[in-house]
Interface confidence: low
């Protein structure tokens, strides 16, 4: 008799793929546009990225550092009207993109939470949650919660409102903290909270360090669903050299949890390459005309348009990974096992029941390495075969689809491999 199938876990929409943050509408749209109506015209692009949710804003009225002139129920007219927002929600719904609204109150000011008027602000947030839930948003984000006194209890209260409306609604909290204990204390009293932090932001050094960070986090959080990003708002290029971007895309899409990206991460948008652009929100490079300040500063291969036409680009890799992440059971909700593969490497396996399994091997180092995959680290349910098919490499030149002998695996500097192999009883 065939073995019984394992019962599928309950999957919420944010479990099924990546979230995409657009914190600055004007920088994202460029060319003088920067409103909700214009954002509607970019939804097809988001669909092409196969992202499941758009984390938008903040877009509410906020007079810098003035709590009385901060209205979480009103859209700043610079971004458009409530009608524009409704229209965006409808269009997004049609394209199966969920909209998460950032309600960080004092986003234009010094302290995001008006530290001296916490109770006033907390009440405003409560009212705003109820208002925007009725308006049809799919969730909320609040950032810089390390600046919010008694954050855990407020988050628990806001989570109750959000989940009380529908289990299908999401609350995301963001913190600049990279300290695991602080992160765990925030998660302790908030079962379904998705938390973005700077936990992985200094992981770029070695494979071993990244492996220990990831495994520590997963062990500490147990079986709760988590998210993966390098910060609560900033671009990957703020933390990583260009040669590690592909590696990190592969890792973020294949770890168990929700990958969270900022606009531009898919093309390697880098503020440092655009003189005069703010680090936290550089202009999105749609095409070469997006940044005409310095002629020749932007080449086609830095832009959405240029990378869309190149199957070997970072954008093409992002799209492929996003597609795999949203349709393969082992990547959607599979078990995770990290194991030794040699110094400088981080490798793990994702598997779910009798579905196709995935092996990820990441070389963080700047020298080529032979992987010594230590299958003895793995439980019997996740054993490795002698060969696995190459689904993709982060570097050009390998023949995709070809079987690779796992004992003889060699990786180029900064190369990541995604391999697949069938379940064997």
């Amino acid at each position: 008799r065939a073995p019984r199938c394992r019962e599928l876990p309950a999957q919420k929409w944010w479990h099924t793929g990546a979230l995409y943050r657009i914190g600055d509408l004007q920088a994202f749209q460029g060319h003088g546009a920067g409103n909700l109506a214009g954002l509607k015209g970019r939804l097809d692009y988001l669909s092409s990225l196969k992202v499941k949710g758009l984390v938008l804003g903040p877009i509410h009225k906020n007079q810098k550092d003035d709590v009385a002139q901060t209205d979480l129920l009103q859209i700043d007219p610079n971004f458009g009207s409530k009608e524009d927002f409704d229209s965006l929600l409808q269009s997004a719904k049609k394209k199966s993109i969920r909209v998460i609204l950032d309600l960080t109150p004092n986003y234009r000011g010094e302290n995001s939470w008006f530290s001296t008027q916490v109770d006033t602000v907390a009440t405003k947030v409560k009212d705003a949650l109820e208002f925007w839930l009725q308006a049809g948003v799919d969730g909320f984000q609040v950032r810089d919660i390390e600046n919010l006194k008694d954050a855990s209890s407020f988050l628990a209260e806001w989570q109750n409102i959000t989940k009380g409306f529908s289990e299908d609604r999401l609350l995301i909290a963001g913190t600049n903290s990279s300290d695991l204990q602080q992160i765990l204390s925030l998660l302790e009293s908030n079962k379904d909270l998705l938390l973005t932090s700077s936990y992985l932001s200094d992981s770029g050094s070695t494979g071993e360090h990244t492996k220990s960070l990831v495994t520590q986090y997963l062990n500490a959080t147990g079986n709760r669903w988590c998210s993966w990003s390098l910060s609560q708002a900033r671009l990957l290029t703020s933390f990583l050299p260009a040669q590690l971007l592909r590696l990190y895309q592969l890792m973020l899409f294949t770890l168990p949890g929700t990958p969270v990206f900022s606009y531009g991460d898919e093309i390697g948008l880098d503020a440092a390459a655009l003189p005069g652009q703010p680090m936290e929100a550089p202009v999105m490079l749609w095409d070469e005309s997006s940044f005409p300040d310095i002629p020749g500063a932007v080449s086609a291969n830095m832009t959405v348009k240029g990378q869309s036409e190149d199957p070997g680009s970072l954008l093409s890799l992002f799209r492929r990974l996003s597609d795999q992440r949203s349709k393969e059971r082992s990547l959607l909700h599979g078990d995770f096992h990290a194991f030794s593969a040699g110094p400088g490497l981080f490798s793990y396996i994702r598997h779910w029941d009798q579905n196709e399994r995935f092996l990820v091997v990441l070389n963080f180092g700047d020298v080529g390495l032979s992987a010594g995959l230590q299958a003895s680290d793995l439980p019997a349910s996740a054993s490795l075969p002698a060969k696995a098919d190459l689904l993709l490499s982060t570097q050009p030149g390998r023949e995709e689809g070809s079987p690779l002998e796992l004992e003889r695996l060699k990786l180029e500097p900064h190369e990541g491999l995604l391999l697949r192999f069938p379940y064997a009883a």
């Epitope: 004007q26 749209q29 460029g30 060319h31 003088g32 546009a33 920067g34 409103n35 109506a37 214009g38 015209g41 970019r42 007219p77 610079n78 458009g80 202009v283 749609w286 005309s289 997006s290 940044f291 005409p292 300040d293």
Partner: antibody, heavy 119, light 107 residues
């Protein structure tokens, strides 16, 4: 309601320059980029270029690169088009037209400014 | 540059009839074609801003179709106020380019 009010007709001599204006009202000026379009009997409608009212960056039709200069003044919600070294070929009606996203077309147009170059 | 060809410079119609105005792009412009109406002494008025989306307030007797290189603007049940010049515009690539226009006249 949305209005793009352009400056009045100009009768100018060959070789000089002219600067025409387009004052926007009824919407947030910096949310929309501004296009400039030339309409003449000979060539129908020709696109001159687009300027971001937010960043001030410009994209020109190569054909007008040495002829036209687009600028904006955010404080007065006004876009400007300056035409240099005028010849009879430049006699036409010039329109400003706003656009709310790079990948979209102009939605509202100014009433046009007639420029006649004659000695 | 992308050339937009409106092969019919003039078209005759009667009130109540339907009419199809065509526009051909010299290369693939996806759906990035807009249509404008211009009456004598007036500035162009947006009808369609991204095929087939009608601009706000445009009557539904105006419909646009097409993608790639071939585009049509159809006016059903023509009214006297529809007699005007009609221009297509491609906004897929810089420089943006217009068709030469089609003048709709009464028979």
């Amino acid at each position: 309601q949305v209005q793009l009010q352009q400056s009045g007709a100009e009768l100018v001599r060959p070789g000089v320059s002219v600067k025409i204006s387009c004052k926007a009202s009824g919407y947030t000026f910096t949310d929309y980029a501004m296009h400039w379009v030339k309409q003449s009997h000979a060539k129908s409608l020709e696109w001159i270029g687009v300027i971001s009212t937010y960043y001030g960056d410009t994209t020109y039709n190569q054909k007008f690169k040495d002829k036209a200069t687009m600028t904006v003044d955010k404080s007065s919600s006004t876009a400007y088009l300056e035409l240099a070294r005028l010849t009879s070929e430049d006699s036409a009606i010039y329109y400003c037209a706003r656009v709310w996203l790079l990948s979209y077309a102009m939605d509202n147009w100014g009433q046009g400014t007639s420029v006649t170059v004659s000695s | 540059d992308i050339v937009m060809t409106q092969s019919q410079r003039f078209m005759s119609t009667s009130v109540g009839d339907g009419v199809r105005i065509t526009c051909k792009a010299s290369q693939n412009v996806r759906t990035a074609v807009a249509w404008y109406q211009q009456k004598p002494g007036q500035s162009p008025k947006a009808l369609i801003n991204l095929a087939p989306n009608r601009h706000t307030g445009v009557p539904d007797r105006f419909t646009a179709r097409g993608s790639g290189t071939d585009f049509t603007l159809t006016i059903s049940n023509v009214q006297s106020e529809d007699l005007a010049d009609y221009f297509c515009l491609q906004h897929w690539n810089y420089p943006l380019t217009f068709g030469a226009g089609t003048k709709l006249e009464l028979k």
